[in-house]
């Protein structure tokens, strides 16, 4: 796969990734009513990051937003700012990439500006990816506790016995969006992985096609094959070389090299 | 106007059975799920069954679970209410009602049929 | 089964008067979700099939004069008329709509002195 096909490739990935982790966060259904071996409620409860919902058996749906900062869960409140966190990166992490993109010509940027973009853009993927992640396992892992502390005790009181009153233990279990963040963090992570690998083939490194100083008769001046190729956008960074003593050699370009995807 | 007529009521020896048909105007029946409620004569109101709009959830009293089924057409606005196995304490005004938009509550009422169960 | 207990089993009073009926419930019908209490109070006329009055327990259906009104949370609930009037005698009842089965309380009936 050439380094354009994979950085391209990785960058909508990560968008993909990253859109869903915007989804995942606005979601409503993070975690919903356990319906199974359950008393049969004439609502269905359901609850996300922002606020909590129920939908009456109408179909009329109502939401109750968390009004408060303080009285809410510490663990919900880590759950917030991780897929926050992982959002903020992701928008730097978009913005850096779109410039790194090597099918994107922006003014005289060269392929190590571009290699170091790619692979700053690749490694917030990868930590926004990660923070989804962390984010939606966190959760579900408060699910699955309050999940069988509310099934050892599916009801608080004796329910008549004393005068005591029963009241109904909602359980809750995964929502859709737990899917959609794992999915979404996982393809953020993924599309990150790929800028990384991408950027390993734009940076200028010496195994790949040195260029050859052609030693032409009269005139002691290097020409590099394929430096002026303006899809590459080398000929503004090509310079001429002395060469030191007669014949084909090579020598390192500090400026620039072709790498083995530019001629695919 | 919302209007909700219920015919096939009349005496039945126990065991026998019945049908109930409830014939709705005056609003979008497929959008709206429908509940038939019974009162026994002199007694209090019965919840008897209830059929989500798209008949995706039906659920019904333990009283007559097992032995009453709810069904609806929607083509033809009609709800209905199988009676099978019925017995001398089935002996009710059977409403057919209307689930409300809002709050779970049963906002329109048909004005009922009876249905005697005695031999 | 939600049991839904009403109190008193019957009243009279005098016109103009104010009138408050209780219903309890054995289970809370309140729903953490959007706030609200699945209760519901009809009234019901002699001869007539009952009539929606009050939903999510303190909401009232349109069309139904302001002088009724309910209150209460969670298992204990009123229903409030400030100042009965001659058509207000009937049989009112409160309704857990909470739950399947969606039972009724036994009913609490009005009578005019």
């Known amino acids: 796969m050439s380094v354009t096909a994979c950085q391209g490739l990785g960058f909508v990935v990560s968008l993909i990734g990253f859109a869903g982790i915007i989804a995942a966060t606005c979601m409503d259904q993070w975690s919903t009513q356990d319906l199974y071996n359950n008393p049969v409620t004439a609502v269905f409860n359901y609850q996300g990051l922002w606020r909590s919902c129920v939908r009456e058996s109408s179909g009329f749906t109502e939401c109750r937003g968390y009004f408060t900062l303080l009285g809410l869960p510490a663990m919900l409140q880590a759950v917030r700012a991780l897929m926050i966190v992982g959002i903020v990166l992701g928008v730097i992490g978009i913005l850096v990439s779109i410039f790194a993109l090597k099918c994107i010509r922006i003014g005289s940027m060269d392929d190590s500006a571009k290699a170091k973009m790619t692979l700053t853009s690749g490694i917030l993927f990868i930590i926004s990816g990660i923070c989804a992640i962390i984010g939606v396992s966190v959760f579900a892992n408060m699910l699955v506790t309050n999940f069988w502390m509310s099934t050892a005790n599916m009801y608080s009181g004796m329910g008549g016995m004393g005068g005591m009153v029963q009241t109904v233990q909602t359980r809750y279990t995964f929502g859709a969006a737990l899917f959609v963040g794992w999915v979404a963090g996982g393809l953020t992570l993924i599309g990150g992985v790929m800028m990384c690998i991408a950027c390993r083939g734009l940076t200028p490194d010496d195994s790949n096609f040195k260029a050859v100083s052609y030693h032409a008769s009269g005139q002691n001046v290097a020409y590099r094959p394929g430096g002026f190729k303006a899809s590459t956008g080398f000929g503004s960074n090509t310079r001429n070389k002395k060469i030191y003593d007669g014949g084909a050699r090579t020598e390192d370009d500090e400026q620039s090299h072709p790498t083995k995807y530019d001629y695919v | 106007e919302v209007q909700l007529v219920e015919s096939g009521g009349g005496l039945v020896q126990p065991g026998g059975s019945l049908r109930l048909s409830c014939a709705v105007s005056g609003f979008t029946f497929s959008s709206f799920g429908m509940h038939w409620v019974r009162q026994a004569p002199g007694k209090g109101l019965e919840w008897v069954a209830y059929?989500?709009?798209?008949?995706?959830?039906?659920y019904y009293a333990d009283s007559v679970k097992g032995r009453f089924t709810v069904s609806r057409d929607n083509a033809k606005n009609s709800l209905y209410l199988q009676m099978n196995s019925l017995r001398a304490e089935d002996t009710a005004v059977y409403y057919c009602?209307?689930?409300?938009?809002?709050?779970?509550?049963?906002?329109?009422w048909g004005q009922g049929t009876l249905v005697t169960v005695s031999s | 089964d939600i049991v839904m207990t009403q109190s008193p089993d019957s009243l009279a009073v005098s016109l103009g008067e104010r009138v408050t009926m209780n219903c309890k419930s054995s289970q809370s019908l309140f729903s953490s979700g959007n706030q609200r209490n699945y209760l519901t109070w009809y009234q019901q006329k002699p001869g007539q099939p009952p009539k929606l009055l009050i939903y999510w327990a303190s909401t009232r259906e349109s069309g139904v004069p302001d002088r009724f009104s309910g209150s209460g949370s969670g298992t204990d609930f009123t229903l409030t008329i400030s100042s009965v009037q001659a058509e207000d005698v009937a049989v009112y009842y409160c309704?857990?709509?909470?739950?399947?089965?969606?039972?009724f309380g036994q009913g609490t009936k009005l009578e005019i002195k």
């Open positions: 309704q857990n709509v909470y739950i399947y089965p969606l039972t």
């Open positions: 009602v209307r689930s409300g938009y809002y709050g779970n509550s049963l906002d329109y």
């Open positions: 059929i989500s709009s798209g008949t995706t959830n039906i």
